[in-house]
Interface confidence: low
């Protein structure tokens, strides 16, 4: 059975999930996706790896561990009652059904106290690639639910937003942990 | 073994020109960031421009837009730094250096050996 | 531009010392922080990225951390090799900008 996370509304989640690069660097694709792990891949993918870098990720859902040493731990901003469920963390391990699958429970609670308003956030800051004008300040913000989705494979026309992400708090804990090598 | 070599420095007359070069190895440009940075001499670091190779996507400090060209031939795993118009101000060693497109993570891990740009009547 | 303030511009330590360097972002640029060693004539070199994880290859000694928009590199025993010049860098936003450098010098 699934393990289970719970955060609050309005809070951040934090779903635990390492692996161990066979060499420093070595790294292995990995997905992020919402529903349990399919046979192959993640369904309704939110975020990915590849060898060497982030290549896709969803406005809420950042890597906030140092991935580059294995810890791959989903970070989600901000939550709502709409994402809970279960989450797939699939460690893209070379071979045929050589994958891990780790199954993740995401149980979300209401808030004691109402929240207050997604957080607006300095858009020229957050993404300064997307406005090259400089001195933007305040009035032009934009929230995080509007922030587009990101695929490395359409870089050439979403080069601005790729190059930037806020992380939530620096959050660690203990959970799914594998051995590559 | 990841390596970046820069090439292409050397003395122009203020108003001139020069291309840099920055050839990599062990490594393929495409999917990284490459920056350029510079040094003034006894100065500290100042960041120039960057290109992503597989967009061609750059970005330019305020310093040298609009005379400074960023590109890349991913064919070759190689930059360039086109400088036109060149300023006394501009005299530096010239650095490439390697980043990457997660921001949050965009320091550089390897640097190349620099090369002298020196601008001078 | 967000800048970035190091501090001290230069120190004088001994062989064994415990050697602390500042840099002060003027906003808040997260944990996207890296420090950098140079040496006369030689490129920088990455000690610390992301505030405080250790670059490979970079000893134990070096350390850094993060409280708020203030950032630390700790040298906790300095080395002969370890004498050069520490710059700071964010990385959270374009410009990238890099401190101005602390020369680490011998007593």
């Known amino acids: 059975s699934e393990v289970e996370y719970r955060a609050e509304v309005g809070q951040n989640a934090y779903l635990p999930c390492f692996y161990t690069p066979a060499a420093p660097g070595n790294l292995v694709p990995v997905c992020w996706g919402k529903g349990a792990c399919p046979v192959f891949e993640c369904g309704n993918v939110v975020l990915r790896t590849d060898e060497r870098d982030v290549n896709y990720w969803t406005s809420r859902y950042w890597l906030n561990g140092d991935f580059r040493k294995g810890d791959v731990s989903l970070t989600i901003e901000n939550v709502t009652l709409a994402d809970s469920g279960i989450y797939c963390c699939r460690i893209q391990i070379p071979g045929i059904m050589n994958d891990e699958k780790f199954n993740l429970k995401l149980v979300i609670k209401p808030a004691k106290v109402t929240p207050a308003p997604t957080r607006q956030r300095d858009f020229t800051a957050a993404f300064p690639r997307m406005l090259t004008t400089r001195g933007h300040g305040p009035a032009e913000t934009q929230t995080l639910g509007s922030l587009p989705d990101i695929n490395l494979t359409q870089i050439s026309t979403l080069a601005n937003e790729l190059r930037d992400s806020r992380l939530a708090n620096d959050l660690r804990d203990s959970g799914a942990t594998i051995r590559i090598g | 073994e990841v390596q970046l070599v820069e090439s292409g420095g050397g003395l122009v007359q203020p108003g001139g020109s020069l291309r840099l070069s920055c050839a990599a190895s062990?490594?393929?440009?495409?999917?990284?960031?490459i920056h350029w940075v510079r040094q003034a001499p006894g100065k500290g670091l100042e960041w120039v421009a960057d290109?992503?190779?597989?967009?061609?996507?750059?970005e330019y400090a305020d310093s040298v837009k609009g005379r400074f060209t960023i590109s890349a031939d991913t064919s070759k795993n190689t930059a360039y730094l086109q400088m036109n118009s060149l300023r006394a101000e501009d005299t530096a060693v010239y650095y490439c250096a390697r980043g990457y497109v997660y921001r949050m993570w965009d320091s550089f891990d390897y640097w190349g050996q620099g090369t002298l740009v020196t601008v001078s009547s | 531009d967000i800048q970035m303030t190091q501090s001290p511009s230069s120190l004088s330590a001994s062989v064994g010392d415990r050697v602390t360097i500042t840099c002060r972002a003027s906003q808040d640029v997260n944990t996207a922080v890296a420090w950098y060693q140079q040496k006369p004539g030689k490129a920088p070199k990455l000690l610390i990225y992301?505030?405080?994880f250790l670059y490979s290859g970079v000893p134990s000694r070096f350390s850094g951390s993060r409280s708020g928009t203030d950032f630390t590199l700790t040298i906790s025993s300095l080395q002969p090799e370890d004498f050069a010049t520490y710059y700071c860098?964010?990385?959270?936003?374009?410009?990238?900008?890099f401190g101005q450098g602390t020369k680490v010098e011998i007593k």
């Open positions: 062990g490594f393929n440009i495409s999917g990284y960031v």
């Open positions: 992301s505030a405080s």
């Open positions: 860098q964010q990385h959270y936003t374009t410009p990238p900008t």
């Open positions: 290109i992503i190779p597989t967009a061609g996507y750059t």
